[in-house]
């Protein structure tokens, strides 16, 4: 199917009323016209745009575009209409930033000025130079009034500034000195926080872009969810599940009269909510619009549950994962609760929060035991590894930003909110505050914000997820706000279920088909798993008992 945004390459057709028709008959949103991006792919959305005033340091293309002045006449067309390289522009025009303009209008490299060789056809590159005897060039003592910039541009590749004593090489905006004399492009995108989502580095500058489904907020330059359902924040307060619309800021009760609900998660596509009740020792599910009716609340798991404190829904493969701090296990089940197995029953002390990345096939969890840590493994329980084990005490909530591939967590003993990339690198402490992070518990991320609940403050806070600034209170007087999730379709991007792509149903697995972590292109897409009392047979698909009926309990 054709990209809905691009409209395909079919026969001539009318675009929607809020779309612009390109010359090549593509349809693009009207707001993309004259935004200096070639969205049509034939430049027609950037032609005939109102002339805009370019900055003094820019060159104005004939079609109104602005480009860096130094790109003019550099042999590469940067203007969509090529006017930066036209004869009219480049004949007797201003030379590039690292060039000297000869009297006849031609350009030579600035470092060739005053090098005692004639480089300009008219010799003007040697005019007005201080004639230094050859023997003096090696003399380090500087005669008063000597301007080194006049000789060979001081050796600077771009800008040479004469000083009272000596001289200084500097660079135009977007460039940096590499070796005191030579300018090279600054890769602003090396800073993971240069942009809220995608950073594209160009020579001398960079540009921020957004992933599909998001659009740039022209004021803040942050990526916001494109028009669609309003995002909402759903949280538990032990006795209820509540909802806050993040746009309208209205507040509603989703599920009343609960006993002791701490953990919850959502499946956006089916509009279902999942939650654990610590007192009843059960995991439940319901459609969000019917969840307030106890008759519509389905019990999924009520066997071998002790203290299910963390819950995560794999919306792609239709599984739920939960931590149990009483049994000291991490388990998985189908979303109907019908098939389940224990993935981890060893080396867990106080497992709490859990989050899943079904796109890459990984899960992440926090453990606030004596040796607190954040761990990750494949969604099938393989490749277990520790992500964070130092400077961590009580990691209560964790959440994933699948777009930036970062994990965020709150530590209620250190009063900190931190983030780290999915491989355990680039750790950043965003906020350290006994006021705003008095006893944080749950955490969620959406767009440019991070949200967290705080038990002592009885409030939900938000802050900028890149730098921890702009802290504000979203809701207060909440009485025990615990887990928190954002409900929006962009939080759960669609992907293929590897177990369904297989020729055999359920990947040929007799019991559970679990996605495998996608570490390389050779990684298996899934593996099979069996109930806790059975073993995977030699075909790695079917389940068998050994002689002892009840021998096996949680693996790995």
């Amino acid at each position: 199917a054709a990209d809905p945004l691009l409209g395909g390459q079919g026969p001539a057709k009318e675009c929607e009323k809020d779309q612009f028709q390109c010359r090549n008959e593509r349809c693009i949103p009207s707001v993309w016209r004259c935004d200096e991006d070639d969205d049509c792919l034939d430049h027609s959305d950037e032609d005939d745009c109102p002339k805009k005033t370019c900055a003094d340091s820019d060159f104005t293309c004939d079609n109104g575009h602005c480009i860096h002045e130094r790109w003019k006449c550099d042999g590469e067309e940067e203007c969509p209409d090529g006017s930066d390289e036209s004869e009219a522009t480049c004949t007797l025009g201003t030379c590039h930033g690292n060039e000297f303009q000869c009297g006849d209008g031609t350009c030579v490299l600035a470092i060739k000025r005053c090098n005692q060789e004639q480089d300009c056809p008219d010799g003007s590159d040697e005019a007005g130079c201080l004639q230094v005897p050859p023997t003096f060039l090696g003399n380090r003592r500087r005669p008063r009034g000597l301007n080194e910039c006049l000789h060979n541009n001081g050796g600077c590749s771009h800008i040479c500034t004469d000083l009272k004593i000596g001289f200084e090489c500097t660079c135009p905006a977007g460039f940096q000195l590499l070796d005191q004399k030579t300018c090279g492009d600054i890769d602003e995108c090396k800073d993971p926080d240069a942009c809220s989502q995608i950073c594209v580095n160009y020579k001398g500058y960079f540009k921020c872009e957004c992933y599909p489904g998001y659009e740039m907020d022209l004021l803040t330059k942050n990526c916001k969810a494109a028009a669609g359902k309003s995002p909402s924040l759903i949280f538990t307060n032990r006795h209820e599940v509540r909802r806050i619309d993040l746009v309208k800021r209205n507040y509603s009760r989703l599920i009343p009269m609960l006993k002791n609900v701490v953990a919850l998660d959502m499946e956006v596509a089916t509009n279902r909510i999942y939650w654990c009740d610590l007192s009843y020792r059960k995991i439940y599910s319901a459609y969000m619009d019917k969840a307030s009716d106890p008759k519509e609340q389905e019990v999924l798991i009520d066997e071998q549950l002790h203290s299910p404190e963390g819950l995560a829904v794999d919306w792609v493969h239709k599984h739920i994962y939960w931590t149990d701090s009483g049994n000291k296990t991490i388990s998985v089940a189908t979303v109907d609760g019908g098939r389940r197995c224990t993935l981890f029953s060893r080396n867990l002390s106080e497992p709490r929060a859990i989050a899943v990345d079904p796109l890459q096939g990984f899960m992440y969890w926090s453990d606030w035991g004596n040796q607190a840590k954040i761990e990750k493994s494949g969604l099938n329980g393989v490749d277990r590894q520790t992500l964070v084990s130092d400077n961590i005490e009580w990691p209560n909530g964790i959440t994933l930003d699948l777009l930036s591939q970062r994990l965020y967590w709150v530590d209620s003993k250190l009063h900190q909110l931190s983030s780290i990339d999915f491989s355990g690198g680039n750790r950043k402490m965003l906020i350290s505050s006994t006021d705003f992070l008095s006893h944080p518990f749950g955490i969620a991320v959406f767009e440019d914000k991070v949200f967290w609940t705080d038990l002592e403050n009885e409030a939900i806070f938000s802050a900028n997820r890149l730098n921890g600034l702009e802290i504000s209170i979203l809701a207060e007087n909440l009485n025990n706000p615990h887990d928190i999730v954002i409900f929006h379709e962009l939080k759960q991007p669609r992907a293929a279920d590897a177990c369904k792509l297989s020729v055999q149903p359920n990947g040929g697995c007799e019991y559970l088909c679990l996605p495998a972590p996608q570490i390389s292109s050779h990684s298996p897409k899934y593996t099979c798993a069996c109930p806790d009392t059975m073993w995977l047979g030699p075909d790695m698909k079917r389940c068998y008992r050994d002689g002892n009926e009840d021998s096996k309990m949680g693996s790995t």
Epitope: E303, G337, P505, T533
Partner: antibody, heavy 118, light 108 residues
């Protein structure tokens, strides 16, 4: 060896109630869902009730819902089936069955006959 | 609910014959089918699960196959102790559990 032994059957008048029992041995009873399956004379098998390991949830087909109640006592390794408002179509051999971890019934008792007279 | 249609209801056979019983589900059951043998006055005995997996004490002359909605059960070389009734069962970890109507294998 897994053993399931049913008891409590017999001839009962229509409209009355009856409670069947099943004594289990040879396995950890509390680890398994248990079920009752019946078979009318010269007819096929029909599943009538299942109970979860802790006894907190039970399942029935629509045909018996409201009249049949399955229960269990894990301390005694016993399964029960309470049948109320007996009808002539409840006449059958009732089998106690263990639901294996993969979902099918892997062990069965020998059955107990219930005859409902009008 | 899923219905299981088993055929034929009765199947005459001689010793040494190969016989096949079929079960058709009203919708795709993803290979979750088991086959049972029942002799008069006895409890059913599990022979095959997950379409084709033989229980450890099931003789190799028994086999099962199928996918989607259509499944079959075969005895390659009928022996005298095989004359009995056979039932298919669609199972899952959650209800309902649905049996086929049964097939009586009789001596021709």
């Amino acid at each position: 060896e897994v053993q399931l032994v049913e008891s409590g059957g017999g001839l009962v008048q229509s409209g009355r109630s009856l409670k069947l029992s099943c004594a289990a041995s040879g396995f950890t009873f509390s680890n398994y869902y248990m079920a009752w399956v019946r078979q009318a004379p010269k007819k096929g098998l029909e599943w009538v009730a299942t109970i979860t390991t802790s006894g907190s949830r039970s399942f029935y087909p629509d045909s018996v819902k409201g009249r049949f109640t399955i229960s269990r006592d894990n301390a005694k390794s016993s399964l029960y089936l309470q049948i109320n408002s007996l009808k002539s179509e409840d006449t059958a051999t009732y089998y106690c069955a263990r639901r294996g971890p993969l979902g099918y019934f892997d062990h069965w008792g020998r059955g107990v006959m219930v005859t409902v007279s009008s | 609910d899923i219905q299981m249609t088993q055929s034929p209801p009765s199947l005459p056979a001689s010793l040494g014959d190969k016989v096949t019983i079929t079960c058709q589900a009203s919708q795709n059951i993803n290979k979750y089918i088991a086959w049972y043998q029942q002799k008069p006055g006895k409890a059913p005995r599990l022979l095959i699960r997950f379409t084709s997996t033989l229980e450890s004490d099931t003789p190799s002359r028994f086999s099962g196959s199928g996918s989607g909605r259509d499944y079959s059960f075969s005895i390659s070389n009928v022996e005298s102790e095989d004359f009995a009734s056979y039932y298919c069962l669609h199972y899952d970890n959650l209800p309902p559990w649905t049996f086929g109507g049964g097939t009586k294998l009789e001596l021709k």
